[in-house]
Amino acid sequence: FERTRSLQDPCSNCPAGTFCDNNRNQICSPCPPNSFSSAGGQRTCDICRQCKGVFRTRKECSSTSNAECDCTPGFHCLGAGCSMCEQDCKQGQELTKKGCKDCCFGTFNDQKRGICRPWTNCSLDGKSVLVNGTKERDVVCGPSPADLSPGASSVTPPAPAREPGHSPQ
């Protein structure tokens, strides 16, 4: 014969937001303040995450779901569930062990996080440089030189202009 799940375990009737209270004959008690249970049938409630220090509260804790944090301005989330915050840099920079440093010549970063990446090599696609790259922006590749001057055999793409006053690290 088939037993229902509730006959096997009275705790299975306890919904999310409650816990099965062994101290009170296994009745379903609401989660205490600053705690939650996201699934039914739990014997304890989990402590809510507190968004302190560099963390800000993105979503408040409820009886059925944990709080969610993000980072204070000037920082961005790292890791699953924003487990850490890492400082932003400016566009045209990357975060090194020594803090935010300008991208080396020939590389760019158009975001406040991440690393500097090399400019696109237009000539690999048989194209020419239409707009030179900067620390903040990739080069813009244009039509191939042959497209620009019909009948011409091959034209060497112009080298990107070196940014004045910027030396590689």
């Epitope: 220090g53 790292l78 850490m84 915050c85 890492e86 400082q87 975060l95 062990k97 803090g99």
Partner: nanobody, 123 residues
């Protein structure tokens, strides 16, 4: 409970010195990078310095290089910031923060912060 508590701030004249301390508890201090940040009045948070688990690697923002020294005593679960040749622009609330454990892929990622200690440089 994981906790960081800063101390040692105060009022100091330009050119003077202060030593900030940060007492850590509730976690294995020697497993983590540690970081000092500061926030000047009306400004955003600024990274100042960080130090790896055994103290063999130390890094500083350019504006304090040669004037500030970060150090740690793992036996005492303590982080320090020795600040010399202080300037008016060093006036800020200074925070110590727990960094990565070496496996996080970031030397600047933080999760636990202290409440801060105020440093005022003025004549």
């Amino acid at each position: 409970e994981v906790q960081l508590v800063e101390s040692g701030g105060g009022l100091v004249q330009p050119g003077g010195s202060l030593r900030l301390s940060c007492a850590a508890s509730g976690f294995t201090f020697s497993n983590y990078w540690m970081i000092w940040f500061r926030q000047a009045p009306g400004k955003g948070l600024e990274w100042v310095a960080n130090i790896n688990q055994d103290g063999s690697e130390k890094y500083y923002v350019d504006s304090v290089e040669g004037r500030f020294t970060i150090s740690r005593d793992n036996a005492k679960n303590s982080l320090y910031l020795q600040m010399n040749s202080l300037r008016a622009e060093d006036t800020a609330v200074y925070y110590c923060a727990r960094g990565g454990d070496g496996y996080s892929g970031s030397h600047h990622g933080t999760d636990v912060w202290g409440q801060g200690t105020t440093v005022t440089v003025s004549s």
